[in-house]
């Protein structure tokens, strides 16, 4: 495989990682898909300093980021542990609410106006933010 | 100049497999995610697939999902459509076209037909 | 899956006036929504992404507008080589999925 070792046009460079910042909403898994298609994933955030400079980014909009509990226990979708990693839940949070009335409980992780996170229904066309990291190998299979 | 040119479409027997390929110059491959669209004669656009730009991720729509497979070689510039157990309804013209951000497909090739029939 | 309805399915004009289509998506794709143009025999091609930005190199004849569900693409003043079929696709979620086609063609 190849390594890259720029980021892509529109995408902003931080700590070895690329990052892009949409800007129209999608679904959380949607917006999952979005982030492979690019060949990257949406942003896992390992600590604050990571936390702040997304947050800058993004302003005061809720922004999907690649944490849920779809499955059951909480998970970054890049396989970074959740139970040791960085956190930054808004108070009583994450509650997995069902009094919002769309069915089921609340899923999804994002960034509220304040940067802080918040769980909720993973339908919401939300904004959300891939990542990938420089110096990564790409998996290029190899053609049958 | 970017372009995109498909080939290896013809006439094929219901149960039998073709492979299409799409040979892109113009721009960098790598980094582009890359899709088939195939119109029935006389009918409109189907989305049939979507390959990331290292080939890591894919897509299908329901209707060819586990009997076709999307690639690629980076090396070569060329994106591949395998096309196994093929029916009467695959029939088409085949254009692999180009994904940019927006998912929409900015550049289109003249595309090929695929003839399914006994 | 999502689907994208356009009307008319056909319109006939002249050169010179001015031609709307709709298209409805089933459920909300916020803005993800493009136009396409195709002419008889020959490759679609792209107009106009994100439900009102035009492509590089199209004529400002061509716009688009709509948010949620429903969307119009508007060609202000038809030109020759405006008779055509036009496709919406939406862009929000997988499978990708275009409306049926609108054919625009001479009165």
């Known amino acids: 495989g190849s390594e890259r070792t720029c980021c892509p046009v529109n995408w902003v460079e931080h700590e070895r990682s690329c990052y892009w910042f949409s800007r129209s909403g999608k679904a959380w898994a949607d917006a999952d898909n979005y982030c492979r298609l690019e060949d990257a994933h949406l942003v896992v955030v390992t600590s604050w300093e990571e936390q702040k400079f997304v947050q800058h980014h993004i302003g005061p909009v809720n922004t999907w980021m690649g944490l849920h509990d779809q499955n059951g226990p909480w998970k970054w979708v890049d396989g970074t542990d959740y139970e040791t990693g960085f956190k930054n839940w808004r108070p009583e949070q994450p509650d997995d609410w069902y009094g919002h009335g769309l069915g089921g409980g609340e899923d999804c992780a994002h960034f509220t106006d304040d940067g802080r996170w918040n769980d909720d229904v993973c339908q919401r066309p939300y904004r959300w933010v891939c990542e990938t990291e420089l110096d990564k190998a790409s998996q290029e299979p190899p053609l049958l | 100049e970017v372009q995109l040119l498909e080939s290896g479409g013809g006439l094929v027997q219901p149960g039998g497999s073709l492979r299409l390929s799409c040979a892109a110059s113009?721009?960098?491959?790598?980094?582009?995610?890359m899709n088939w669209v195939r119109q029935a004669p006389g009918k409109g656009l189907e989305w049939v697939s979507a390959?990331?730009?290292?080939?890591?991720?894919?897509f299908y729509a329901d209707s060819v999902k586990g009997r076709f497979t999307i690639s690629r070689d980076n090396s070569k510039n060329t994106l591949y459509l395998q096309m196994n157990s093929l029916r009467a309804e695959d029939t088409a013209v085949y254009y692999c076209?180009?994904?940019?951000?927006?998912?929409?497909?900015?550049?289109w090739g003249q595309g090929t037909m695929v003839t399914v029939s006994s | 899956d999502i689907q994208m309805t356009q009307s008319p399915s056909s319109v006939s004009a002249s050169v010179g006036d001015r031609v709307t289509i709709t298209c409805r998506a089933s459920?909300?794709?916020?803005?993800?929504l493009t136009w396409y143009q195709q002419r008889p025999g020959k490759a679609p091609k792209l107009l106009i992404y994100?439900?009102?930005s035009l492509q590089s190199g199209v004529p400002s004849r061509f716009s688009g507008s709509g948010s949620g569900t429903d969307f119009i693409f508007t060609i202000s003043s038809l030109q020759p080589e405006d008779f055509a079929t036009y496709y919406c696709?939406?862009?929000?979620?997988?499978?990708?999925?275009f409306g049926q086609g609108t054919k625009v063609d001479i009165k």
């Open positions: 113009g721009f960098t491959f790598s980094s582009c995610a």
């Open positions: 696709q939406q862009g929000n979620s997988f499978p990708f999925t």
């Open positions: 994100d439900t009102s």
């Open positions: 076209a180009k994904r940019t951000p927006y998912d929409v497909f900015d550049i």
């Open positions: 390959i990331s730009g290292s080939g890591g991720s894919s």
């Open positions: 459920q909300g794709i916020t803005s993800w």
